[in-house]
C-alpha cells in the first residue's frame, strides 16, 4: 500500500481542516488508514482522524482543531496499521479556505432595488470576521448567457442592485462566496443558491 498523491490540507481557520490524498489503488480508507495530527506546542496531545472514501483510491479526513492562530503548525502522519506511509506538516494559516456564507436572502420589496443579504460565516471573535470580501453570482434560469458576478469589496455582507439591470418577468438565482486577502485564501465554496422572480415597473415612456 502506497500513497500516490500526498495529503494536501485546507483550513477553515476556525475549527476544521480538511485533508485529501490518493492511494495507489482502491482503499477502504476508514478501516485501513489513520491520519495522525499534533500541534507543535508545549504538551499538545496527538489526535487520530478516521478518513472517509473520496472516490475509489481517494481519501478525505476532517481534522478537528481548537481556535487557530497564525503561528500554529501541525505534524501530520499517515498510518496503515503499524506502517508509516507518509509524514509531513501543515500550517493552517497558509492554507485557508473560508467557510461559505449562509442565509442568502433576496429582498425585492425595496422600490425598484434588489437587496441581497447574507451572513458572515465567522463569529465576531474570529480574525477572518472582519477580513472577508465576497463575490455574488446572479444568473438567469432561462438564459445561460445571462450570468454575472458582482465583487463586494466592502465588509458589509450585502449588495444592492437596480432591479432594472436584470430582465423583468423571469426567474433569477443568486449565490455568494467569500475570500480573505490577508491570508491569500482560496475562495470558499458557493453558498446554497436562492431563487426569485424579477419584476419591476418599466418607466413610463413619453413620446
Amino acid at each position: 500500500m502506497k500513497v500516490l498523491q500526498e495529503p494536501t490540507c485546507v483550513s477553515d481557520y476556525m475549527s476544521i481542516s480538511t485533508c485529501e490524498w490518493k492511494m495507489n489503488g482502491p482503499t477502504n480508507c476508514s478501516t485501513e488508514l489513520r491520519l495522525l495530527y499534533q500541534l507543535v506546542f508545549l504538551l499538545s496531545e496527538a489526535h487520530t482522524c478516521i478518513p472517509e472514501n473520496n472516490g475509489g483510491a481517494g481519501c478525505v479526513c476532517h481534522l478537528l482543531m481548537d481556535d487557530v492562530v497564525s503561528a500554529d503548525n501541525y505534524t501530520l502522519d499517515l498510518w496503515a496499521g503499524q506502517q508509516l506511509l507518509w509524514k509531513g506538516s501543515f500550517k493552517p494559516s497558509e492554507h485557508v479556505k473560508p467557510r461559505a456564507p449562509g442565509n442568502l436572502t433576496v429582498h425585492t420589496n425595496v422600490s425598484d432595488t434588489l437587496l441581497l443579504t447574507w451572513s458572515n460565516p465567522y463569529p465576531p471573535d474570529n480574525y477572518l470576521y472582519n477580513h472577508l470580501t465576497y463575490a455574488v453570482n446572479i444568473w438567469s434560469e432561462n438564459d445561460p448567457a445571462d450570468f454575472r458576478i458582482y465583487n463586494v469589496t466592502y465588509l458589509e455582507p450585502s449588495l444592492r442592485i437596480a432591479a432594472s439591470t436584470l430582465k423583468s418577468g423571469i426567474s433569477y438565482r443568486a449565490r455568494v462566496r467569500a475570500w480573505a486577502q490577508c491570508y491569500n485564501t482560496t475562495w470558499s465554496e458557493w453558498s446554497p443558491s436562492t431563487k426569485w422572480h424579477n419584476s419591476y415597473r418599466e418607466p413610463f415612456e413619453q413620446h
Epitope: L42, L43, A46, D77
Partner: antibody, heavy 117, light 107 residues
C-alpha cells in the same frame, strides 16, 4: 552552552513549604517553555509542572494540582517552583528542564528535596 | 493516564554485547516516544525522539524502533560509557509519562 542550575532544595517537615529556583543561561530564555520533572528515591521520573515561554500557559498533572505553582521571570532568566503542604512522597530530586514541545530537551543537575520529620 | 512499562528494571551485560531495551505503552503511541539516558550521578539526557531519531551527539551504535504500543532501544556493541539507566517517555497525551527505567549493569 545551554545551562540550567537548580537551587533551593532542603530538608523540610511534612506540611511545610519550599521554593525552588532555576537559573538559565546560554540560550534565549524567553523563547522556550520550561518545566520541572522530579525523580523519586526509587528512580521514577514524574512530570511536575510546565510553563510556556511567556508564562501565559501553565500545566500541572492532576496529582500535582493545588500544591505546586510554576512561574518564571524572563528578565532574570529564572524559573521557579513554589511547593506547599509537602508530604513524604514529595521527597525527590527536582530537575529544571527546557521543553520545546513534547520532550525534555535539556536538564539541569537537580536539587534535592527531602520531606521528613 | 498512559502507563509506560519497561519490563526489565535491570540487565547484566558485557562489553561488546548487543543490548535491547523494551518499552510497552498502555495505548498506541504512533511513534510519539522519546528515550533518555541517565548515567550514575547525572541528570537524564534526551537520546531519541519520534521513536527512531537520534539526538545530536548520540553514537550510531544506538537505534530506536517499534510502532503501536511496543518500542525498542538497541545498542549494537555495548561500550563502557553506555552503562546507564534508560527511560522511555510518551508524548501521545498529557500528562506525558515515563517508564520505570532499565538499568544496565556490567557482569
Amino acid at each position: 552552552e545551554v545551562k540550567l542550575v537548580e537551587s533551593g532544595g532542603a530538608l523540610v517537615q511534612p506540611g511545610g513549604s519550599l521554593k525552588l529556583s532555576c537559573a538559565a543561561s546560554g540560550f534565549t530564555f524567553n523563547s522556550y517553555g520550561m518545566s520541572w520533572v522530579r525523580q523519586t528515591p526509587d528512580k521514577r521520573l514524574e512530570l511536575v509542572a510546565v510553563i510556556s515561554s511567556d508564562g501565559a500557559y501553565t500545566y500541572y498533572p492532576d496529582s500535582m494540582k493545588g500544591r505546586f505553582t510554576i512561574s518564571r521571570d524572563n528578565a532574570k532568566s529564572s524559573l521557579y517552583l513554589q511547593m506547599s503542604s509537602l508530604q513524604s512522597e514529595d521527597t525527590a530530586m527536582y530537575y529544571c528542564t527546557l521543553i520545546t514541545t513534547w520532550y525534555f530537551d535539556v536538564w539541569g543537575a537537580g536539587t534535592t528535596v527531602t520531606v521528613s520529620s | 493516564d498512559i502507563q509506560m512499562t519497561q519490563s526489565s528494571s535491570s540487565f547484566s551485560v558485557s562489553l561488546g554485547d548487543r543490548v535491547t531495551i523494551t518499552c510497552k505503552a498502555s495505548e498506541e503511541l504512533y511513534n510519539r516516544l522519546a528515550w533518555y539516558q541517565q548515567k550514575p550521578g547525572n541528570a537524564p539526557r534526551l537520546f531519541i525522539s519520534g521513536a527512531t531519531t537520534l539526538e545530536t551527539g548520540v553514537p550510531s551504535r544506538f537505534s530506536g524502533s517499534g510502532s503501536g504500543k511496543d518500542y525498542t532501544l538497541s545498542i549494537t556493541s555495548l561500550q563502557t560509557e553506555d552503562v546507564a539507566t534508560y527511560y522511555c517517555q510518551q508524548y501521545w497525551s498529557s500528562p506525558y509519562t515515563f517508564g520505570g527505567g532499565t538499568k544496565l549493569e556490567l557482569k
